[in-house]
Interface confidence: low
């Protein structure tokens, strides 16, 4: 389904159209798709409107370690990367772009996954890492959330909202020390209730690129600089999750 060809995976990060990334992508300026208007106060203006998180905790409030959710796959079912020496430097800091092998993908087993879902990223994230999430939006969906987590901080919160004051909007933000920062908002909204989707997040040296259904959507400049410490991706919201995986490109 992902029509990637990884045998010639790139080792550099200068190519704006890396293998496996939507080909329509051009050289977007940093922050493309982000809200260009006024800087918002540091408080989180999107704070849980009533019903915004039906039956679940707000983003970032994932209890416990992977497998803490009832019915979630037990820890260890995620196929890990090769254990050969040097694959992950002991400090967790990749020694080079190739520190994650360009084979894979690694991640969750295929088949329906329990949401909320945690995808471990054992060595953090590094440039040229491509995370792919496949699923189907539930009928009458309210929200989707991806949370790239560094401990209790959320380095990158990607939050499509299907009905915020009767509007559909994608909100991106970062949470540090329990405080949300300035929101970046995008009104281009490629998700549809009841329909399948593919979200791809490509890690670049200074930003995350996000594509949905093979079309570039936005990019989000890194606010958390220690990429190697972003060790978990939380996936939540009104979706049926089919798979979540990552690979190097």
């Amino acid at each position: 389904a992902d029509n990637f060809s990884l045998h010639d995976a790139l080792s550099g990060s200068g190519n704006p159209n890396p293998q496996g990334w939507p080909g329509a992508w051009g050289n977007q300026p940093a922050g493309a798709g982000g809200y260009p208007g006024a800087s918002y106060p540091g408080a989180y203006p999107g704070q849980a409107p009533p019903g915004a998180y039906p039956g679940q905790a707000p983003p970032g409030a994932y209890p416990g370690a992977p497998g803490a959710y009832p019915g979630a796959p037990a820890p260890g079912v995620y196929p890990g990367p090769p254990s050969g020496p040097g694959a992950y430097p002991s400090s967790g800091q990749p020694s080079a772009t190739g520190a994650y092998p360009a084979t894979g993908p690694y991640g969750a087993p295929a088949g329906p996954l329990i949401v909320p879902y945690n995808l471990p990223l054992p060595g953090g994230v590094v440039p040229r890492m491509l995370i792919t999430i496949l699923g189907t939006v539930k009928p009458n969906a309210n929200r989707i959330a991806l949370d790239f987590q560094r401990g209790n901080d959320v380095a990158f919160h990607f939050n499509p909202r299907f009905n915020e004051n009767n509007r559909r909007v994608i909100v991106c933000n970062t949470k540090l020390d329990n405080n949300w920062g300035r929101e970046e908002r995008q009104s281009v909204f490629p998700f549809e209730s009841g329909k399948p989707f593919k979200i791809q997040v490509l890690v670049e040296p200074d930003h995350f690129k996000v594509a949905v259904n093979d079309a570039h959507l936005l990019q989000y400049n890194h606010r958390v600089k220690k990429l190697n410490e972003i060790s978990k991706l939380g996936i939540s919201g009104d979706i049926d999750l089919t798979s979540a995986s990552y690979t190097m490109i």
Partner: antibody, heavy 120, light 110 residues
Framework: EVQLVESGGSLVKPGGSLRLSCAAS????????MNWVRQAPGKGLEWISS????????YYADFVKGRFTISRDNAKNSLYLQMNSLRAEDTAVYYC?????????????WGRGTLVTVSS | QSVLTQPASVSGSPGQSITISCAGT?????????VAWYQQHPGKAPKLMIY???YRPSGVSNRFSGSKSGNTASLTISGLQAEDEADYYC??????????FGGGTKLEIK
């Protein structure tokens, strides 16, 4: 500089038609909801219509439904308001307004307005 | 078209604080629909002062604050200054995806 410039306002007879335009610059026009808001002389603000970035979600105030049509051309960074069956009570300054990316209600960029006068 | 209810006018002296109310219904202000406030000087376009009930855009003085309780929103201006003399409008989304404005409040600085 983020800017909205309206044009097309003029004197028109009751029952007539007019098309207002709004040229946007300084921001990624296709990302944001846009609105038309009007203000009759000496009166308050009155929201007319809104359109989202992809032209998929369009809303109108009851008093203009069936008479006014909002549209946009993202390639031209332009917003339009086609006004038909104009009435004397449509006389007002018409503002082109960007909704802030935070869609909780804030309209953060306003044009200077264009005056529409409906009179025989 | 329903209109949010604001007092026609309020007044205050320099340095004082004033509050302007904006009464709606459960279909607009009270229905989890966020309120914004605008300032308009004569002959000028409106300016966004508060969005999402209580948040200030950058560049707006922290003398302006917003709040909401039930079906009523409020704008408070502290430390009144001469340049605050203007018309103030509240606005909200409504349950049918429209927007609605209040009738406006004229602030007079004595």
């Amino acid at each position: 500089e983020v800017q909205l410039v309206e044009s097309g306002g003029s004197l028109v007879k009751p029952g007539g038609s007019l098309r207002l335009s709004c040229a946007a610059s300084g921001f990624t026009f296709s990302n944001d909801d846009m609105n038309w808001v009007r203000q009759a002389p000496g009166k308050g603000l009155e929201w007319i219509s809104s359109i989202d970035g992809s032209s998929r979600s369009i809303y109108y105030a009851d008093f203009v439904k069936g008479r006014f049509t909002i549209s946009r051309d993202n390639a031209k960074n332009s917003l339009y308001l086609q006004m038909n069956s104009l009435r004397a009570e449509d006389t007002a300054v018409y503002y082109c307004v960007r909704s802030s990316g935070y869609s909780g209600g804030g309209m953060d960029v306003w044009g200077r307005g264009t005056l529409v006068t409906v009179s025989s | 078209q329903s209109v949010l209810t604001q007092p026609a006018s309020v007044s205050g002296s320099p340095g004082q604080s004033i509050t302007i109310s904006c009464a709606g219904t459960s279909s607009d202000v009270g229905g989890s629909y966020n309120v914004a406030w605008y300032q308009q000087h004569p002959g000028k376009a409106p300016k966004l002062m508060i969005y999402s009930d209580s948040y200030r855009p950058s560049g707006v003085s922290n003398r302006f604050s917003g709040s909401k309780s039930g079906n009523t929103a409020s704008l408070t201006i502290s430390g009144l200054q001469a340049e605050d003399e203007a018309d103030y409008y509240c606005s909200s989304y409504t349950s049918n995806s429209a927007r609605v404005f209040g009738g406006g409040t004229k602030l007079e600085i004595k």
